[in-house]
Each structure stands twice: as structure tokens, then as C-alpha cells.
């Protein structure tokens, strides 16, 4: 059967079901794509205009293809195999009641199945497989592809080899003034700012134009490459570094023994497998942890999560999100949010963006 002959695939959500919040639809669809990108070299990005490879549509009855929907129950959705035009598109029956949970029909689980078709998979005869033809709710927080699903998709696209996963496959030093440069994590350390990318970090001393690039392993040999989040509690001379479900504590620029530890010791639920970004605000003595399109707030004095979290990033940080790469705190009033090659200066007192910059604007580029 057909496959996509490229590894960067775009998708667009044509319209939204009224059954769910738009943010929840975006999140469910993004997480469904992520299920497949986690086990392949494929990368998916959402576009809001123009022609995407995969169009996501909510429709009822006859809707422009040969396969009219049948009302509530029965056929929940269908998707076309890879190709141009309608190829790859995923259609969801609007007569179903779409949900984020076990009631109605779970959009995430259905989307994982349909995206499997969009990528070229047929149905599986293994009842444990997501590509099994009948819908069955499973706990989405512990959802995993079956071995059969993984075998099937990797037979089409291969596995996510390390050099395919890295945006910088040969691990060479990224070009600092590349306008498309993005960062994995950013944090202050005293009067310096550390910018992490792959196995490197740049050191920017405040108000000085000069920056230097270093290997993470040259400063901290016991730490991994690909740091994903970082924050500083300056009053304690502490820096926390995160990768996957682990974190390391650096005190006075030295790694503490008995690390790494699990991020779940902060109180995250089990489905959180990694942190995208983190920032400590000394005025509130709170750390904000950003995970996908949500954030948690952690009380550093009481060493526990504040109640009422997670919350949606887009709801509480106007103009930011739905997802961020990195963030740091500066000048007692700003968060600097990084999204791809863009950076947003955000006044947390006024609660709005005050400046939009390129991510590498700190380096005099």
C-alpha cells in the first residue's frame, strides 16, 4: 500500500466539533499524532491555513466522499491512505458525541486509529492493537501502542533512530545566528543565561555581547544531552535540569549526588512523561511547569503542587501557547517564552506580551 514519501507531514483541523473545547480537540489530535511520531522518524506539524497533507474534518451524513456517515453509533470515523488530495484525510462523524474521557466516544483514541490509516496502516486482527477495527475505551493516561501496531508502522517508516530524532543529526554545533534556531531549554544562572540545544549550551553573561558555546558534558559530565527544561532558584544557588521523566539538581554549579530523580516526586500524575519548560518566580516563590498545552504551579516553600492545576497555557498566558519550548524569568517582571524560532517577552504583572523577538536575539544576531 501507499506510504508518505517524506518524514515531515502537515495536518490541519478543518473544523471543530461543538462537543468539546477547541483546545481539547487540538490537544487530542496533537497527542494522537505524537503516538505515531514517538515510534517512527515522522514529524507532524499543525498548520492553520493552506493545503495540509492530512485534513481533519468533523462531518455528518454525506460529506464529499463516497462514504457517507451513518448517524450515531456504527461508523465513528474513517481515513484515507497516504496520497494527494483527499489522501491522508481523517473524517470524524459529527453525530457521535466526542469527548476527552470514557463517556461518549474518545476523540484521542479514535484519532490514533484513524491516523494509523492516514499513515498507511490497515486493520489489525490483534484485539489489543489500536488498529483493531472496533472501538474500545482504554485509559488514555496509560495508553500504549501494541507490539503489532509498532511492528506495522515501523515496517512502513522504520524506527525513530537517534540521528533522525535530533534536529541536528550530525551533532555539529548549531549556527547561533540561524534565524530558524530554537532552544530546548533556557534558564538564568546568577547573572548568566544558559541556552540549551542538543548536546550544547550557550552562555550569555547579562548585558555583555559576547557568548560562548560549550558541550554540556564539558561542564557536567554526568548529565545527558538534550536537556528539555531548566529553572533556577537563585536564592538557594540551585538549578534544576529536566530530561524525559528525570531531573538533576545543580547546586553552586555542581551536580548533587543521588540524582537523577523522578519528576513524579514533584507530584505530577503518571501520564506526565516529560517537562517542556519550567520557570521559577521568586516574587511568588512558585515554579511553573509547562507540559504540552497545560501548566502546573509548584509551591517551592511547601514542596507541593498548588491545587487547581493543571490549567491551559492559552487561558492564563494571553498570546502564549498552546505549547512552549522554553522559558526563563528576568528583570523581576518578565517571563521570556520561546516557541520555535520566536520569543515573547511577557509582563506577568500586566499579563500580556510586551515584545516579540527572535529566539536568538540575545546574541546580537
Amino acid at each position: 500500500g501507499p506510504v508518505w514519501r517524506k518524514h515531515y507531514i502537515t495536518y490541519r483541523i478543518n473544523n471543530y466539533t461543538p462537543d468539546m473545547n477547541r483546545e481539547d480537540v487540538d490537544y487530542a489530535i496533537r497527542k494522537a499524532f505524537q503516538v505515531w511520531s514517538n515510534v517512527t522518524p515522522l514529524k507532524f506539524s499543525k498548520i492553520n491555513t493552506g493545503m495540509a497533507d492530512i485534513l481533519v474534518v468533523f462531518a455528518r451524513g454525506a460529506h464529499g466522499d463516497f462514504h457517507a456517515f451513518d448517524g450515531k453509533g456504527g461508523i465513528l470515523a474513517h481515513a484515507f491512505g497516504p496520497g494527494s488530495g483527499i489522501g491522508g484525510d481523517a473524517h470524524f462523524d459529527e453525530d457521535e458525541f466526542w469527548t476527552t474521557h470514557s463517556g461518549g466516544t474518545n476523540l484521542f483514541l479514535t484519532a490514533v486509529h484513524e491516523i494509523g490509516h492516514s499513515l498507511g496502516l490497515g486493520h489489525s486482527s490483534d484485539p489489543k492493537a489500536v488498529m483493531f477495527p472496533t472501538y474500545k475505551y482504554v485509559d488514555i493516561n496509560t495508553f500504549r501502542l501494541s507490539a503489532d501496531d509498532i511492528r506495522g508502522i515501523q515496517s512502513l517508516y522504520g524506527d525513530p533512530k537517534e540521528n533522525q530524532r535530533l534536529p541536528n543529526p550530525d551533532n555539529s554545533e548549531p549556527a547561533l545566528c540561524d534565524p530558524n534556531l530554537s532552544f530546548d531549554a533556557v534558564t538564568t544562572v546568577g547573572n548568566k543565561i544558559f541556552f540549551f540545544k542538543d548536546r550544547f549550551f550557550w552562555l550569555k553573561v547579562s548585558e555583555r555581547p559576547k557568548t560562548s558555546v560549550n558541550l554540556i558534558s564539558s561542564l557536567w559530565p554526568t548529565l545527558p544531552s538534550g536537556i528539555e527544561a531548566a529553572y533556577e532558584i537563585e536564592a538557594r544557588n540551585q538549578v534544576f535540569l529536566f530530561k524525559d521523566d528525570k531531573y538533576w539538581l545543580i547546586s553552586n554549579l555542581r551536580p548533587e549526588p543521588n540524582y537523577p530523580k523522578s519528576i513524579h516526586s514533584f507530584g505530577f500524575p503518571n501520564f506526565v512523561k516529560k517537562i517542556d519548560a519550567a520557570v521559577f518566580n521568586p516574587r511568588f516563590y512558585r515554579t511553573y511547569f509547562f507540559v504540552d498545552n497545560q501548566y502546573w504551579r509548584y509551591d517551592e516553600r511547601r514542596q507541593m503542587m498548588d491545587p487547581g492545576y493543571p490549567k491551559l497555557i492559552t487561558k492564563n498566558f494571553q498570546g502564549i501557547g498552546p505549547k512552549i519550548d522554553a522559558v526563563f524569568y528576568s528583570k523581576n517582571k518578565y517571563y521570556y517564552f520561546f516557541q520555535g524560532s520566536n520569543q515573547f517577552e511577557y509582563d506577568f504583572l500586566l499579563q500580556r506580551i510586551t515584545k516579540t523577538l527572535k529566539s536568538n536575539s540575545w546574541f546580537g544576531c
Epitope: 496520497g83 494527494s84 488530495g85
Partner: antibody, heavy 122, light 103 residues
Framework: EVQLLESGGGLVQPGGSLRLSCAAS????????MHWVRQAPGKGLEWVSG????????MYADSVKGRFTISRDNSKNTLYLQMNSLRAEDTAVYYC???????????????WGRGTLVTVSS | DIQMTQSPSSLSASVGDRVTITCRAN??????LNWYQQKPGKAPKLLIY???SLQSGVPSRFSGSGSGTDFTLTISSLQPEDFATYYC?????FGQGTKLEIK
């Protein structure tokens, strides 16, 4: 080179039967949806029927449902249309057309045969 | 059920003219619309698929646009070989056709 060649047309009386064939070459026939589209003399195009790559899914226009049967033999790279209870209004040139690969039909007809004329008349 | 309305049903134009044919659906069909050209005694030929994508081998003077319910086929500069009948189509439904004739 993709080629589709229809055969089996001819003159038949109302109420009679006819079986059309479409021989395919130049592509992996068993991967593709296939369709029949017809055109009455001096009129526009009308979709008649479609069949999935394995033959497990078939679709028909309301005007032929219950009278026509689409089928395929992937070992022979051939598409068929069995037409029963023929009526005068079934008189047309019948084209076979190739659609896309995959579990569902896109209705995107990228290759067509030259057609075979079916005339239903007493 | 979805219906397709094509207009005009016939059109007279000269070589070099810019010509536009429209197709309207009675409900959204997203970008799932194709255009075909048919010459007398010949099989139809796919020109445009998915509303705006040019089929391989089709001259660039042909273009398509639209999404939802309203679609357009444009021939930027008519050539003698372009005089034919044009059909829009989505799934099992064809428009009535537009016969393009020499003025």
C-alpha cells in the same frame, strides 16, 4: 503505461442482461479502487458503481442498485459489470476508471478506458 | 444529498481569452472537487484534483480554486485544443457540464 480496455458492449433488448469487462495493465490492479461511469448519448457523465481493491466493498448509484453487480478478478487484472433487467435509459457509453489506493475511495478518476457502447432497444 | 450545480452550461470564447467556469455544492465538500475535460468521442481526462492541484501533464494555463461550496476552473489563455466540455465532480456526483465553444 496505465491502460484500461472495456469490452462486452452491444445491443440488448429491455429486460435483458449484459456483462462488461475492463482489462487493466500498467499498474498493480489489486491496489486500486475501480469504478464504472457512463454517458448517455449527448448527455453528461454519470457515476454507476465502484469496488474496493480486495472486492470486499461495493457501491452503486441509486439508478442501478439491485440490477447491476460490480466485481473484479485481481488474478486476471479485470473489472466486471454484470447488468441485469436492462432499461432503455441504461443506453450509454460505459467507461471504467481507476481511483486511488487505500481503504476508502476518493472518487478521483485519474485514468479512464475508451468506453464500450451499450444500447438497450427493442 | 449533495448536489453540484455547474455554470454556465455553455460558453463561447476566442483563442487567447481568459475563461472561468464555476461549480457550486449545496453543502460543504471541503476541497474534494475535481475537474475533467472531455472532447467528442473521447474519454474524460482529469485536469484538476482537490480543487486546486494540477494533474501531472496538464498545462499550467489551467487552474482551480475554491473550498467549501464554491469552486472555479480558470483557463488563463484559451488555446485551440481547449475547446471541449468541462465537468466538475465530487465522489459519485458530476456537474452537468460546460460546453466551451469557439466564438
Amino acid at each position: 503505461e496505465v491502460q484500461l480496455l472495456e469490452s462486452g458492449g452491444g445491443l440488448v433488448q429491455p429486460g435483458g442482461s449484459l456483462r462488461l469487462s475492463c482489462a487493466a495493465s500498467g499498474f498493480t490492479f489489486s491496489d486500486y479502487w475501480m469504478h464504472w461511469v457512463r454517458q448517455a448519448p449527448g448527455k453528461g457523465l454519470e457515476w454507476v458503481s465502484g469496488i474496493s481493491p480486495s472486492g470486499g466493498m461495493t457501491m452503486y448509484a441509486d439508478s442501478v442498485k439491485g440490477r447491476f453487480t460490480i466485481s473484479r478478478d485481481n488474478s486476471k487484472n479485470t473489472l466486471y459489470l454484470q447488468m441485469n433487467s436492462l432499461r432503455a435509459e441504461d443506453t450509454a457509453v460505459y467507461y471504467c476508471a481507476r481511483d486511488i489506493v487505500g481503504p476508502y475511495s476518493a472518487g478521483l478518476f485519474d485514468y479512464w478506458g475508451r468506453g464500450t457502447l451499450v444500447t438497450v432497444s427493442s | 444529498d449533495i448536489q453540484m450545480t455547474q455554470s454556465p452550461s455553455s460558453l463561447s470564447a476566442s483563442v487567447g481569452d481568459r475563461v472561468t467556469i464555476t461549480c457550486r455544492a449545496n453543502q460543504s465538500i471541503y476541497t474534494y472537487l475535481n475537474w475533467y475535460q472531455q472532447k467528442p468521442g473521447k474519454a474524460p481526462k482529469l485536469l484538476i484534483y482537490a480543487a486546486s492541484s494540477l494533474q501531472s501533464g496538464v498545462p499550467s494555463r489551467f487552474s482551480g480554486s475554491g473550498s467549501g461550496t464554491d469552486f472555479t476552473l480558470t483557463i488563463s489563455s484559451l488555446q485551440p485544443e481547449d475547446f471541449a466540455t468541462y465537468y466538475c465532480q465530487q465522489a459519485g456526483i458530476f456537474g452537468q457540464g460546460t460546453k466551451l465553444e469557439i466564438k
